[in-house]
């Protein structure tokens, strides 16, 4: 119904009042509900109402505005501190324990972050971004910089419908439509071999608990299980050679561990060589990444940290140990 | 298949001590932390001890610390638990059990040995 | 350190029973618990991990519940090979503390 310039939507009436023409909505159940769009912000709840907009947000703490957009710092908030004598004893151990497992510790010290203390070091949003990994959009925490809010924002929960076909068909130069898709993975970039690469700038630099050989093996896995962690692709870098740059890795050499080995190993000397994992060099390849998302890393430095940040979940699904993002040609170091 | 071996126990006296393996197969030792747990004699489990092979980082129970030194030779696939200054009430089967989280102390233990007897009496 | 309080200590059942027992750690432990089950001379299985987490290869008769401090493990219907004894695991922080453990027996 209308009246004067006034159009009104389906199901509602329209009434003259001391302000002017109004449309309303006798039964909210006949009208288009203003919570179909989901205005409200933040986690914040959606009640339906009879006039426009047609719905009233009810915001979560510490969010408020009609959409719940707007953030209110609580007043003084102290920053937190480690107070636990325990987790200053169990810092930088290489073990991570859960008791310490949080920002006011650095994450045991970088025991739970693959040695990386504050993932979100360059996040400069008003909001912990590290408590908003909840399973629910924060638009506050959508930026690179606070790693994409854990790609919270565009529906992480899809799954590989094909997965287990998929992982098995992953990177294997043979395109398979079914999985070429953000959440297969691309299909490990075998249907774009005649795109050009799109490389983030810099390399992921990973020590991961398994001897070369066995990662050398496991690597289409083990890519795409990194790239689906960080919604791209990755490649292992080759060296001037064109060697893939995966090196046998030797251990800590850090003082502390070596006292803590010659304490554990009958003959230390003997078996200071012994292979304790790999360091692996990564690229970013964002070639499908771009044409199906605004989220894709341009350089390393977050990817690293997001990594990071999946270990602080305990979501890895490999012995990763550190994770570092080199921005210049590495060295072939141990 | 992933196992656990425990060796080594036995009758020993009061103030005596005495050393238990754990060999492990089927998984990368490395990656993942081992712990030893006891149990008395008709009694309930008591965590012991904590070792992540990689880092070699420990951590016990105030019950045998100062006592008792777990290890872990990499090269061998096997932890190794040192009791020294035994007591009466240390006897019990001890198990060793892996972790099902690679670098954390703060997972479950997925896989455990059949346990040896540690008997410590006069 | 953290103290792991189960009841009942021990329970009777009989086959086909609905069976529950509790777990209440002293403080907040979040999701960090474990379910073992021990039978008669051997060594303890995990059964559930995570709070509420099958372990692989663990029957779906076998659930668990809570987080904070309260915790559950039910048995919706108990089979001959479950009379064991039951233990609950905090591994939130060190050192690691388990429940004095529900015996199971038959009615």
């Known amino acids: 119904s209308s009246c004067g310039q006034v159009k009104c939507r389906k199901g509602e009436q329209c009434v003259h009042t001391a302000s002017g023409p109004r449309c309303f909505c006798p039964s909210p159940r006949d009208c288009e509900s203003g919570c179909a769009s989901s205005p409200c912000q933040h986690g914040g709840s959606c009640h339906p109402q009879r006039q426009p907009p047609y719905y009233s947000c009810q915001c979560a703490p510490p969010f408020s505005g009609s959409r719940c957009e707007l953030y209110t710092a609580p007043p003084s908030t102290p920053p937190a501190t480690c107070l636990s004598q325990y987790c200053a004893d169990k810092a930088r151990d290489g073990v991570c324990d859960e008791a310490c497992n949080s920002h006011a510790c650095q994450w045991d010290g970088g025991d739970c972050s693959l040695t990386m203390e504050n993932p979100w070091a360059n996040c400069s949003s008003p909001l912990p971004c590290w408590d908003y990994i909840n399973n629910q959009c924060d638009e506050l925490c959508n930026t690179v910089e606070c790693l994409f809010d854990n790609f919270e924002c565009q529906g992480n929960s899809k799954t590989c419908k094909y997965d287990k076909y998929c992982a098995d068909h992953f990177k294997d130069n043979h395109c398979d439509q079914g999985c070429n898709s953000e959440e297969c993975g691309w299909d490990g970039l075998d249907c774009a071999a005649d795109q050009p690469e799109n490389l983030a700038e810099g390399t992921l630099v990973i020590v991961v608990l398994m001897p070369p050989e066995q990662l050398l093996q496991d690597a289409r896995s083990f890519l795409r299980a990194l790239g689906t962690l960080l919604h791209t692709n990755l490649r292992i870098k080759r060296d001037s050679q064109g060697e893939l740059m995966v090196y046998p890795y030797y251990g800590e050499k850090s003082a502390a561990m070596k006292k803590q080995r010659m304490t554990r190993r009958s003959l230390p000397g003997e078996q200071e060589q012994e292979v304790a994992g790999s360091k692996v060099f990564l690229e970013i390849d964002n070639r499908q990444c771009v044409q199906d998302s605004d989220h894709c890393f341009k350089n390393t430095d977050a990817a690293a940290a997001l990594l990071a940040s999946h270990a602080i979940q305990g979501t890895l699904s490999y012995p990763l140990v550190s994770v570092v993002s080199e921005s210049l040609t590495p060295e072939r170091t141990q | 298949e992933v196992q656990l071996v425990e060796s080594g126990g036995g009758l020993v006296q009061p103030g005596g001590s005495l050393r238990l393996s754990c060999a492990a197969s089927?998984?990368?030792?490395?990656?993942?932390?081992m712990s030893w747990v006891r149990q008395a004699p008709g009694k309930g489990l008591e965590w012991v001890s904590y070792i992540y092979p990689y880092s070699g980082a420990t951590y016990y129970a105030d019950s045998v610390k100062g006592r008792f030194t777990i290890s872990a030779d990499t090269s061998k696939n096997t932890a190794y638990l040192q009791m020294n200054s035994l007591r009466a009430e240390d006897t019990a089967v001890y198990y060793c059990?892996?972790?099902?989280?690679?670098?954390?102390?703060?997972?479950?233990?997925?896989?455990w040995g059949q346990g040896t007897l540690v008997t410590v009496s006069a | 350190d953290i103290q792991m309080t189960q009841s009942p200590s021990s329970l009777s059942a009989s086959v086909g029973d609905r069976v529950t027992i509790t777990c209440r750690a002293s403080?907040?432990?979040?999701?960090?618990l474990a379910w073992y089950q021990q039978k008669p001379g051997k060594a303890p299985k995990l059964l559930i991990y995570?709070?509420?987490s099958r372990a692989s290869g663990v029957p779906s008769r076998f659930s668990g519940s809570g987080s904070g401090t309260d915790f559950t493990l039910t048995i919706s219907s108990l089979q001959p090979e479950d009379f064991a004894t039951y233990y609950c695991q905090q591994y939130y922080s060190s050192p690691l503390t388990f429940g004095q453990g529900t015996k199971v027996e038959i009615k």
């Open positions: 059990a892996r972790h099902s989280g690679y670098y954390r102390i703060s997972s479950a233990m997925d896989v």
């Open positions: 995570g709070a509420s």
């Open positions: 089927g998984y990368s030792f490395t990656s993942y932390g």
């Open positions: 403080q907040s432990i979040s999701s960090y």
